[in-house]
């Protein structure tokens, strides 16, 4: 797992960005775009 | 100091639809994941969706995929909510809400919208 | 998606009280676990991040602990303003999900 404050701090933010590209569970992501956290 | 005003309360009939608005104020608007959260008595808190403010890019849970549509607005930093074919379950608080800064979690919430669907 | 179940869903309790709410995951999520706290008319408010962390605020009565699939908010002194309804919220995997509440009554 990541312990930074980054990774902590922005956990949600980095899944979200990253979920493009892939349907997991019961979610979809749409308008892939690519951003950095 | 980070605001989101939302707009106001909405009576709608089944099946039509319902877009609500929540305009940002305090930080850069572009540079957060805006996420919509909805409220109904007995059903608790249920995150519908998410729209990166700067690309458009939205995420969406498969329960509302077919209905929901989350845009944002950078020239007026406002986020949108619109849901369609409503129905009688559709009655609840609908709030925006932006992760924290420093901390994880929703650190900032708009005061909720009211929406209510009935005959 | 993860499960988040909270216990008891109410509870009667008397100013100066110590409360403890308890919530579970259904798997794994470390200590990615928030707290918030829910009044009538109002937006939910962001109490304790990450499991123990406190928000911007928050008094020094409140406070978390846990971790993996078990989790605690504690209430050391019930004060007038913490009769509300408290939820957790996993952020360790998308979606985000909430527990069903806990509604803190006065006695």
């Known amino acids: 797992g990541c312990n930074t404050a980054t990774c902590v701090t922005h956990r949600l933010a980095g899944l979200l960005s990253r979920s493009g590209g892939m349907v997991k569970s019961n979610f979809v992501p749409t308008n892939v775009g690519s951003e950095a956290f | 100091q980070v605001q989101l005003v939302q707009s106001g309360a909405e009576v709608k009939k089944p099946g039509s639809s319902v877009k609500v608005s929540c305009k940002a104020s305090?930080?850069?608007?572009?540079n957060y994941w805006m996420q919509w959260v909805r409220y109904a008595p007995g059903q608790g808190l249920e995150w519908m969706g998410a729209i990166y403010e700067g690309t458009g890019k939205t995420v969406y849970i498969q329960k509302f995929a077919d209905r929901v549509t989350i845009t944002a607005d950078k020239s007026t930093s406002t986020a949108y909510m619109e849901l369609s074919s409503l129905r009688s379950e559709d009655t609840a608080v609908y709030y925006c809400?932006?992760?924290?800064?420093?901390?994880?979690?929703?650190?900032?919430w708009g005061r909720g919208t009211t929406v209510t669907v009935s005959s | 998606d993860i499960q988040m179940t909270q216990s008891p869903s109410s509870l009667s309790a008397s100013v100066g009280d110590r409360v403890t709410i308890t919530c579970r995951a259904s798997?794994?999520?470390?200590?990615?676990l928030n707290w918030y706290q829910r009044k009538p008319g109002d937006a939910p408010k962001l109490l304790i991040y990450?499991?123990?962390g406190y928000h911007s605020g928050v008094p020094s009565r409140f406070s978390g602990s846990g971790s993996g699939t078990d989790f605690t908010l504690t209430i050391s002194s019930l004060q007038p303003e913490d009769f509300a309804t408290y939820y957790c919220?996993?952020?360790?995997?998308?979606?985000?999900?909430f527990g069903g509440g806990t509604k803190v009554e006065i006695k």
């Open positions: 305090g930080y850069t608007f572009g």
């Open positions: 798997k794994d999520i470390s200590k990615y």
């Open positions: 919220q996993q952020g360790d995997a998308l979606p985000p999900t």
């Open positions: 809400a932006r992760l924290s800064d420093y901390v994880s979690g929703f650190g900032y």
């Open positions: 990450y499991t123990s």
